[in-house]
């Protein structure tokens, strides 16, 4: 806490400028008017204040706004934002996306700070849902943001927001998260034509059910093996050899290299060997000719 001392004659700051970097902490406290600071916050970032001096400036704003800073001040905090505590930020009411962007920029390229984490939570809660523009902004700074939400939290994401999602934003999502996101993506992209639809939906297919994979197999999509390997095993198992062949198109040859890996391995076990042989890939492990095909849903439990 800086002691209250009178400002020396002639040192009263008429504006926020570079001359203030030569002020001692007590002089800043005594000679800088808090209201002036609030209206000229945008200048603070251009001045190389020390951390100690920034502490004084923060203290002045805290005194001026004990209930929390107004958004006009928050938007121009810049590096002073890093001096804020999560408790400070919980007092704020940030509604502008521009304010959010300005503050995220301060922390850009670094792991999420406690300040940023609190800010984002406050902002999203204030909006009521994760709308497209907010998601667009958050994933631009934090590509893994979507995958850091629980399936329950993802369920409140409106389908319209899915348009903001890029393939790399889903890189770290687990299958349960994709289970929630896929139906939203399907709804969001439903009016697109076949090839455009596949480009958009491809990243979400880890949550697709069998019937949707069957439908895709009729559309000449030529799914690559990397995408196929991320499909739900339970969704792949009921597909016929002909359907997988149509789904993969020219990429079907890649099945041989993946025959020991899920879901290909489990799918092979469900197919008649005769049908697998029609692919001409030398896939082995199918049901021998003449054997009765029973429901193999217990296969997983027995393996």
């Amino acid at each position: 806490e800086v002691e209250k001392t009178a400002c020396p004659s002639g040192k009263k700051a008429p504006e926020i400028d570079e001359s203030l970097i030569f002020y001692k902490k007590w002089e800043l406290e005594a000679c800088v008017d808090a209201a002036l600071l609030a209206t000229q916050m945008d200048r603070v970032n251009a001045i190389p204040f020390t951390y100690e001096q920034l502490d004084v400036l923060k203290h002045k704003l805290d005194e001026l706004y004990p209930q929390g800073y107004p958004e006009s001040v928050i938007q121009h905090l810049g590096y002073l934002f890093l001096k804020m505590s999560p408790e400070d930020i919980r007092k704020w009411n940030v509604t502008s996306l521009e304010t959010l962007k300005a503050l995220l920029e301060v922390n850009k390229g670094h792991e999420m700070s406690p300040q940023v984490a609190t800010l984002i939570d406050r902002f999203v809660k204030g909006r009521g849902q994760l709308d497209k523009d907010t998601l667009d902004t958050l994933t631009a700074f934090y590509p893994g943001y979507l995958c850091s939400l629980s399936p329950e939290e993802l369920s409140s994401v409106p389908p319209s927001s899915i348009w903001a999602v890029r393939p790399q934003d889903l890189d770290t999502c687990d299958p349960r998260q994709l289970d929630v996101l896929y139906p939203k993506a399907r709804l969001a992209f439903q009016n697109m034509n076949g090839s455009e639809y596949f480009v958009k939906i491809q990243s979400f297919l880890g949550g697709a059910p069998t019937e949707d994979l069957k439908a895709l197999s009729q559309q000449n999509v030529s799914m690559d093996l990397a995408t196929f390997m991320k499909l739900r095993t339970d969704a792949v198992l009921p597909l016929t050899v002909a359907e997988v062949q149509k789904l993969l198109g020219p990429h079907v040859e890649g099945l041989k290299a993946e025959e020991r890996h899920r879901p290909v391995r489990d799918w092979i076990l469900r197919q008649r060997q005769d049908d697998l042989d029609t692919l001409g890939l030398g896939l082995q492990g199918g049901i021998p000719n003449g054997y009765l095909v029973l429901d193999l849903s217990m296969q997983e439990a027995l393996s």
């Epitope: 999420m112 984490a117 934090y142 893994g144 995958c147 850091s148 629980s150 329950e152």
Partner: nanobody, 115 residues
Framework: QVQLVESGGGLVQAGGSLRLSCAAS????????MRWYRQAQGKQREWVAS???????SYSDPVQGRFTISRDNARNTVYLQMNSLRPADTAVYYC?????????WGQGTQVTVSS
């Protein structure tokens, strides 16, 4: 920088139990998802279970009902309780910490289930 260290792996008879631990060091803030993956010899790495920032959990079909993921925030540790183990559970088990920006991996711990 975040570091993850797994422990608790070993050799166990089919039907037995093991408890894996993953201790995280380094500072992370914001939402964190802790996940377990496993990789059997010559196979691809596969997801096993997740525990989200909210505390909710999810599991892959092969382990549902047998494995339980939990965490101790005070100790910065996540656990995987594995019951009714099967030979098919034999693999190197990896701990993963996912933040909104990065994904961190441990070195893995070997679990071998003999019949």
């Amino acid at each position: 920088q975040v570091q993850l260290v797994e422990s608790g792996g070993g050799l166990v008879q089919a039907g037995g139990s093991l408890r894996l631990s993953c201790a995280a060091s380094g500072s992370t803030f914001g939402r964190i998802v802790m996940r377990w993956y496993r990789q059997a010899q010559g196979k691809q790495r596969e997801w096993v279970a997740s525990i989200y920032d909210s505390g909710s959990t999810s599991y892959s079909d092969p382990v549902q009902g047998r494995f339980t993921i939990s965490r101790d925030n005070a100790r910065n540790t996540v656990y995987l309780q594995m019951n009714s183990l099967r030979p098919a559970d034999t693999a190197v088990y990896y701990c993963n910490l996912g933040t909104a920006l990065s994904s961190y991996w441990g070195q893995g711990t070997q679990v071998t289930v003999s019949s």
